[in-house]
Every structure is written in C-alpha cells, then in structure tokens.
Amino acid sequence: SAGAGSHCQKTSLRVNFEDIGWDSWIIAPKEYEAYECKGGCFFPLADDVTPTKHAIVQTLVHLKFPTKVGKACCVPTKLSPISVLYKDDMGVPTLKYHYEGMSVAECGCR
Amino acid sequence: SAGAGSHCQKTSLRVNFEDIGWDSWIIAPKEYEAYECKGGCFFPLADDVTPTKHAIVQTLVHLKFPTKVGKACCVPTKLSPISVLYKDDMGVPTLKYHYEGMSVAECGCR
C-alpha cells in the first residue's frame, strides 16, 4: 500500500457506513469503495499528479526551505458518485443514482 | 502562523523567484504573495473549509481508525492569477496579466 515514502496515488479505502454512523440514513450499500489519496508529492512533480502552478512553486520552496514550507499534498482532484438507497425526510427508502463526490476518481498534488 | 494544531487556513507565503530558480525567465516581480494552506482538517469539518463528501467520510473514518486512514488535507481549493513580466521564447520581455494558478484564493479540506 502507498505510504509516505511512495508517490501520490489512489489506494483502496473500503468504508462501512455503520463505522461512520451513516447507517441511520443510508440503507444500502452497507459499504463502498471510497478510495484514498496516499503518498508524497516529491520533487519533481510528475505529470500524472496534475500539479497546479502553485503546487509546483510550493514544492520548489519546500526544497529550499523544508522546515518553513510544507510539501504539496496528495488529495482527490476528481470525485465520482455512487448509488445509494437512503431514507428520505419521511424515512421512506429512496434511491439516489448519483450521490456525488463520494469516491475518488483521480488523485493529484495540490 | 498556522501550525498543525490550528485549523485549515490561508497563511502568508512570500515567494522569491530567485529562490526557486525562476528569475531566469521571470523579470518582474522579484517576489510575490503565493500564500500557503496550513493547519489540520479536524472533526467536525467546518463549512469554511468547504469539505467534499469524500473529505467528510475520510474524516469520520480517520476518527474511528486513526492509524489506518489519514485526515483530509488542507489544500488550495481556489487559485488566483498574478501579473508577470517574463521573457518569451525569443527572450523578449512580455507582459502576462493573468498568469493563472499562482496564488491561493481559498483553502479547504480535501
């Protein structure tokens, strides 16, 4: 699995809704693949981490002043929806095909 | 300044183009305010860090399994341009009013 020593990448993160207390309103699925962005944003930032100009600048400043400025951070840059069966305001089981922003599609350095 | 103990916020980061080796092609300014996003993404994530659903989920999973899953990360969520006088391909000083993505406008938890 991607640790601090490896470069920024998407790794598996299975989330159980009961663990986070969302089982009170999400009926199904019981768990889903959320993914997580893990790893470091090391110099030089590769194209696959789609760095912004600011991330490139911050990486260069960190290189010169590592104690003063932090590295860019490996975060989700694109998210995907999942389908959920949830309880609506009245508690009635209701299907949302596209519950946006729940799963990582892409990671990058920001 | 905002450290790991404080919550995610925008802090000052003056960048000198000579320090990062960009003075070879950026003529002016000599330095600029890039800002940096610093601080932690602690539970509960406040509205001002505009968390995505994934960031909220990851924060809740981190709360339950702190050694297995990291916190969401404080990163730039909106960037601003700066104006630069640079040398074009032929070395001619050229003004770019909007050199995009160089300065942090907003920080958030992602």
Partner: antibody, heavy 126, light 110 residues
Framework: QVQLVQSGAEVKKPGSSVKVSCKAS????????IHWVRQAPGQGLEWMGG????????YYAQKFQGRVTITADESTSTAYMELSSLRSEDTAVYYC???????????????????WGQGTLVTVSS | QSVLTQPPSVSGAPGQRVTISCSGS????????VYWYQQLPGTAPKLLIY???NRPSGVPDRFSGSKSGTSASLAITGLQAEDEADYYC???????????FGGGTKLTVL
C-alpha cells in the same frame, strides 16, 4: 406505460409455501420498488413488504417478518413474494404494486403505489 | 384492526357530494403524505389521489383530497353510479417503518 402482470391462482395446503410472481413491463425496473399488499375475502388492504431491486433490499411488515421473503430478478424485471407456513387465514388476493424510488421524481408521487397488478388468489385449504 | 380509521360505509344520491374521513396519528398522516385508492368491485386498487391532494391524469376533478393535522378526507362531488366502490386511505408510518392503510370505506350510490 408500466404494467404489472401476476402469476395465476394457487390452492395450497396448510403448512406449505406459495411463491407468487409479478412481471413488470414498461419503464425502468431499477427505478421501482415492488410492494406486496394482500386482501382477505371481504377485508381491507394489508401491506406485507417491498423490495428495491437495484440493491436487492427488502423490508417487511413486522407481522410477516420471518414468514415472507420478497426477491427480484432484474434480468427478467420480475419480483417474487414467497409466504411460508401457510394457514387458512392467509387465504387472500395478493397484489403487487409499484412505487417509484428514484429521487428524481417528486416526493408526493414517489410514495404512491401505482400501478397495481391484477391480483393472485391464494387459497389455503386442507 | 387497521392503523388508519375510516368509516365502514357512506352513501349518497347521484349528483350529491360525499366525504370519506381517514384518521391517523402524528407518525403517519401527521407527518407524511396521504394517498387514496379506489377499488371497483372485483378489480385491483387504483391510485386516486397522491400527496394529499393531487390527482393523477385521468382521474376526474370531482375527486379531491385534503389533510389537516392527523386526519385526511376524500371528497366526491357530483356523485355518479360508477363511483360505487371501496375507497382506501394510505400513508407511510415513520415510527413503525411500514405502509399503513385504512380499513376501507364502501361507497353506495343510492
């Protein structure tokens, strides 16, 4: 236009099981919940349970818990209701009814049972 | 015994107005929408009113629904012979997590 067509009448012995089918045509099966409602002779309507085929999630009225199983086959757009340990009081007409579950539909209509199947008479007799 | 209470029967002459009441509690009618179904002799029920007071297409405007507190009612004006049927009210019960029906009201057109 959505239509629900149910299987034919059944005569069963006490203690046995019955499985009634409900085939949907028209519309998108994954947008539905299929519910089962029964009506004993000369009596009112009684909700038994429902299933959301998209996730295969079923929920039941307490009264029938453990005795009823509702399933669905998305490939054939068919829902099934199986009732076990039959007794004479289970003699009734069993109806399937659609409820739209997708939240892209206004909540007022989303909670309605519409349309209904033609009904299946199940007679439990020794 | 049904969770929602309806009168067993009502009657009226052709052209008259009749109302059918449906009484519930705070966990069903009091907090959720009410639905009315018409069941003609020997046929399956048919949706008549949805969301308290909405008519599906094809249902004459002689039929109207209303709700106040924990009670609802169905009004039929200009009574016709073909209105002779059983009428059922229905709502979701938030507390019990079930769909509940009234016992049904038999309408006789004199």
């Amino acid at each position: 236009q959505v239509q629900l067509v149910q299987s034919g009448a059944e005569v069963k012995k006490p203690g046995s099981s019955v499985k009634v089918s409900c085939k949907a045509s028209g519309g998108t099966f994954s947008d539905y919940a299929i519910h089962w409602v029964r009506q004993a002779p000369g009596q009112g309507l009684e909700w038994m349970g429902g299933i959301i085929p998209f996730f295969g999630t079923a929920y039941y009225a307490q009264k029938f818990q453990g005795r009823v199983t509702i399933t669905a086959d998305e490939s054939t757009s068919t829902a099934y209701m199986e009732l076990s340990s039959l007794r004479s009081e289970d003699t009734a007409v069993y109806y399937c009814a659609r409820r739209i579950v997708s939240d892209s539909v206004a909540v007022q209509y989303r909670h309605a049972f519409d349309p209904w199947g033609q009904g299946t008479l199940v007679t439990v007799s020794s | 015994q049904s969770v929602l209470t309806q009168p067993p029967s009502v009657s009226g002459a052709p052209g008259q107005r009749v109302t059918i009441s449906c009484s519930g509690s705070s966990s069903n009618i009091g907090s959720n929408y009410v639905y009315w179904y018409q069941q003609l002799p020997g046929t399956a029920p048919k949706l008549l009113i949805y969301g308290n007071n909405n008519r599906p297409s094809g249902v004459p405007d002689r039929f109207s629904g209303s709700k106040s507190g924990t009670s609802a009612s169905l009004a039929i004006t200009g009574l016709q012979a073909e209105d002779e049927a059983d009428y059922y009210c229905n709502a979701w019960d938030t507390k019990a997590y079930v769909w509940v029906f009234g016992g049904g009201t038999k309408l006789t057109v004199l």
